[in-house]
């Protein structure tokens, strides 16, 4: 007797797993920036503190009733999908609420960031278990909405953030697009994106995953017994901030970096139509639906790895994007891709002692993204080994020197605009293990990282066809680190990580007459850990 | 996930008559003004102003005063709502958007924000 | 497997007492609300009593305040229903029932009670 | 205390034909109503929670709408395991009351 939503994000074999004390209560406490809440709901009684805090504007119309039912509707709701009894994620959950949304849903920004403040405030004058704090609300982008959500991040804080229900990139709204949240878009029954009238959620790259957010079951403010079910991007993020209430609740250490890394490694992977989003943003959008993690003590140990995609270059000239990972992560290869094709490749770079993974645009280019690898790798230790463009001669290869060091990933870069040279920098597995291999007037960047036990081995997939796009999988056990295209007779635009696949994109010249020699190649640097063993390239 | 999203931002600067009134603020703002994108969410008229990282809690509050002081030569009433340093250092607002520039050139103001509406999802 | 399970009812005096217990097992007991209904022969249903989880809270039938206690024990996993003053217009079937949003999603199969001189 | 009127205490049908039967609260009940199905020497079985939402393995043919006071319990095609007493209850506020019951038989 399961409603949907909980039965998706709860593997079957999870639900009678005891997530929370033998007392039934739980050591996270979750913050929810809401509408007021009946606290007296069955749901939720006993589970639920009203703060003292309330920063919302006025009503607008002179003629607003304020029914305490409906200024409670959305709050009332959220508590208990988080907490609830019957119908929440994270049954033993304390939740504190603070009202930063009127009767008719809406606050201001300054609101919300008095309200970020208070939580901090608390936290220093109280300090206590891990905090989650869930934000089911948007607004456009500011920027200060967001470095608030950055250092209240920086303080262990886990914030879960709404995408947005305005079928539009959650890169515009705020707090969607802070870094440090994380952001949630909605799905249906069938995970499919939800449709809200004429909008839906939101989508983009800075949607982290999506949770069920369509006729969701919860406690209704119109009596203590009363249920109804609501829609939206606020009931998506509550799922996964009920999630992140149990997996701290089991594992109260995890960071944010691992709780994010988590929840996407074990999330439902490909089950989304990806053609309800509009065409630019389907290679931005996350394909994956929240489910509880196992615990860490069944899976601790392996190499995290996420895609964290820059925002696009702009056409001009000069333009760079930039993609960064979180502090904790590490940056294990860095590539781009352009729809256009003219790009003059990528590299890793020092910005304010953070490696960055920067894409470069090329003169006629309608712009690139930056695609950064960042992982989470104890003890890991990276540096880059550059060389410079070739001006003739062979072609010059990239390896890692330094002692117990393997390669993880592969950039390159032209500094001249020929869309002939970028016959891409080579990797070869057959014949030059554990090699970055450059064309002339190629700049080749090999990242090399050292950590107890790494070891990594290349992947290569060939298509001599005409095709689009050649894809190449790590098998089980083994993490994609690394991506890049090795272009056969067309043009390449360039590759990415989605999950654990490289993806190779090309303009297809309709030859298909190809020889194997031509053919375009996935190329993927596969890595595990295994910390008993020593760092080791793998031949194949 | 965002460097600066779908923003407007604004480089105010005070007619130059009005800088020989102004001691202290007589250099040229480097800070920079921020308003939502969306016409219809703005709120003009409150202001977060944010001031560098490194500000110290005490520079808050003098500079939320200076800016008072500002005003009230010029023959605006300001309104102090509240004082941010738990998260980052900064000041609300309640003020005329006039007064804009002369905000922009205060000592450690890195930008202002024109405050804005937040939705329930 | 969800279940509940009430003890033998039986036939009693007017003006006696009797206690009704309800095992439950299949489920955390301590997560809901538990509930008594009733049903004379042949006649509708009658809801008795409940008890929010810790047994803290309780809500009667008006008619049934002062002369029936619902109570449980959490670390037993077993719900009661202690009826004093028994009348003949109690005799009835009398159904365990647990509560999910706040209606009764699992029944015990009943145990009759018959109040006769 | 809320009175529940359930108006019909026996309809009859067909197999195979689509009935509803009506439910109306002496007061205001917003959407907290259940439906249950009881056959003979059985408990009483949960169909239908908060006005409108399936219990869990309940077919889809079992419907519930409405809210306030006035709500309506639909089969849309009855079979021979449907032929059973129908009550509904309202759990908006303790005591919790029940209709009297419509018992559903074949012409």
């Known amino acids: 007797s399961i409603p949907w939503n909980l039965e998706r994000i709860i593997p079957a074999w999870q639900q009678t797993e005891e997530d929370s004390s033998p007392d039934g209560s739980s050591q996270v406490e979750v913050y929810l920036l809401d509408t007021s809440i009946q606290s007296g709901h069955r749901e939720i009684e006993g589970r639920v503190t009203i703060t003292d805090f309330n920063s919302v504007p006025e009503e607008d119309g002179t003629r607003f009733h304020r029914q305490a039912s409906k200024c409670d509707s959305h709050g009332t709701h959220l508590a208990g999908v988080v907490s609830g009894r019957d119908a929440g994620v994270a049954k033993g959950t304390s939740l504190h609420s603070l009202r930063v949304l009127n009767c008719q849903g809406k606050g201001t920004v300054s609101g919300t960031l008095i309200g970020l403040e208070f939580i901090r405030k608390s936290q220093l004058i109280q300090p206590s278990g891990p905090l989650v704090v869930l934000l089911p609300l948007a607004g456009g982008y500011s920027r200060i909405l967001n470095t608030a959500c950055q250092r209240l991040a920086r303080t262990g804080v886990v914030l879960v953030a709404a995408a947005g229900n305005f079928r539009d990139d959650a890169c515009l709204y705020s707090p969607a697009s802070a870094p440090e949240v994380i952001t949630v878009g909605a799905t249906n029954a069938q995970d499919q994106p939800v449709t809200l009238g004429t909008l839906g959620t939101n989508f983009g790259r800075c949607v982290d995953l999506f949770a069920p957010g369509k006729d969701i079951i919860g406690a209704s403010s119109d009596c203590s017994t009363c249920y109804m079910s609501q829609s939206g991007t606020s009931q998506a993020a509550a799922h996964v901030a009920g999630i992140v209430a149990m997996m701290l609740n089991r594992d109260p250490a995890l960071t944010l970096a691992e709780l994010r890394q988590r929840l996407i490694l074990f999330s439902t992977k490909d089950v989304i139509n990806m053609a309800w989003f509009p065409e630019d943003q389907r290679v931005l959008t996350p394909n994956r639906v929240a489910t509880l993690p196992p615990s860490t003590q069944e899976t601790g140990g392996q190499l995290l790895c996420r895609t964290v995609w820059s925002a696009h270059s702009g056409p001009t000239r000069t333009a760079t994007a930039t993609a960064r990972c979180a502090p904790e992560e590490e940056l294990l290869s860095c590539s781009s891709f352009s729809r256009s094709g003219r790009r003059r490749g990528d590299r890793i770079e020092a910005i304010g002692g953070q490696q960055v993974c920067k894409a470069l645009n090329a003169f006629g280019g309608e712009g690139v993204y930056a695609v950064a690898r960042c992982c989470l790798l104890p003890r890991v230790n990276c540096s880059i080994h550059n060389t410079p463009a070739a001006r003739a001669g062979p072609q010059t290869p990239v390896h890692c020197h330094q002692k117990d060091h393997v390669l993880t990933g592969c950039s390159f870069h032209w500094e001249v605009e020929n869309l002939r040279a970028q016959q891409q920098p080579l990797l070869r597995s057959r014949h030059q293990p554990g090699q970055c291999v450059g064309h002339q007037e190629a700049s080749v960047h090999a990242s090399c990282c050292h950590a107890p036990g790494l070891e990594c081995k290349i992947k290569e997939h060939g298509i001599a066809g005409p095709a689009e796009q050649v894809t190449v999988a790590c098998e089980a056990g083994w993490t994609l680190t690394g991506c890049n295209v090795l272009p056969g007779a067309s043009l390449p635009l360039g590759a990415y990580s989605v999950d654990n696949v490289c993806v190779a994109r090309i303009r297809d010249a309709g030859r298909a007459d190809r020889t194997s020699e031509e053919a375009t190649v996935a190329a993927a640097i596969c890595c595990r850990s295994r910390p008993s063993a020593k760092a080791s390239w793998v031949h194949q | 996930q965002d460097e600066d999203g779908d923003y407007e931002e604004l480089m105010l600067a005070l007619p130059s008559q009005e800088d020989s009134l102004v001691d202290e603020a007589s250099h040229v703002a480097t800070a920079t003004f921020r308003r939502c994108s969306k016409e219809a969410w703005r709120l003009p008229g409150t202001y977060v102003v944010v001031l560098m990282e490194e500000t110290q809690r005490l520079q808050v509050e003098q500079t939320a005063h200076r800016l008072q002081t500002w005003a009230a030569r010029r023959g605006y009433v300001i309104k102090v709502l509240h004082v941010f340093y738990d998260l980052f250092p900064g000041f609300l607002v309640k003020m005329s958007s006039d007064l804009l520039g002369l905000a922009l050139k205060l000592p450690h103001v890195e930008y202002i924000e024109e405050d804005s509406l937040v939705f329930a999802q | 497997e969800v279940k509940l399970v009430e003890s033998e009812g039986g036939l009693v005096q007017p003006g006696s007492s009797m206690k009704l217990s309800c095992t439950a097992s299949?489920?955390?007991?301590?997560?809901?609300?538990m509930a008594w209904v009733r049903q004379v022969p042949e006649k509708g249903l009658e809801w008795v009593a409940n008890i929010n989880y810790d047994g803290s809270n309780t809500s009667y039938l008006d008619s049934l305040k002062s002369r029936f206690i619902i109570s449980r024990d959490n670390a037993k996993n077993i719900l009661y229903l202690q009826m004093s003053s028994l009348k003949s217009e109690d005799t009835a079937t009398y159904y365990c029932?647990?509560?999910?949003?706040?209606?009764?999603?699992?029944w015990g199969q009943g145990t009759s009670v018959t109040v006769s001189s | 205390d809320i009175v529940m009127t359930q108006s019909h205490k026996f309809m009859s049908t067909s197999f195979g034909d689509r009935v509803s039967i009506t439910c109306k609260a002496s007061q205001d009940v917003s959407n907290a109503l259940a439906w249950y199905q009881q056959k003979p020497g059985h408990s009483p079985k949960l169909l239908i929670f908060s006005a409108s939402y399936r219990y869990t393995g309940v077919p889809d043919r079992f419907t519930g709408s409405g809210s306030g006071t006035d709500f309506t319990f639909t089969i849309s095609s009855v079979q021979a395991e449907d032929l059973a007493v129908y009550y509904c209850?309202?759990?908006?506020?303790?005591?919790?009351?029940f209709g009297g019951g419509t018992k559903l038989e074949i012409k």
């Open positions: 029932a647990r509560e999910k949003f706040a209606a009764m999603d699992y």
């Open positions: 209850q309202q759990h908006y506020s303790t005591p919790w009351t």
């Open positions: 299949g489920f955390t007991f301590s997560d809901y609300y």
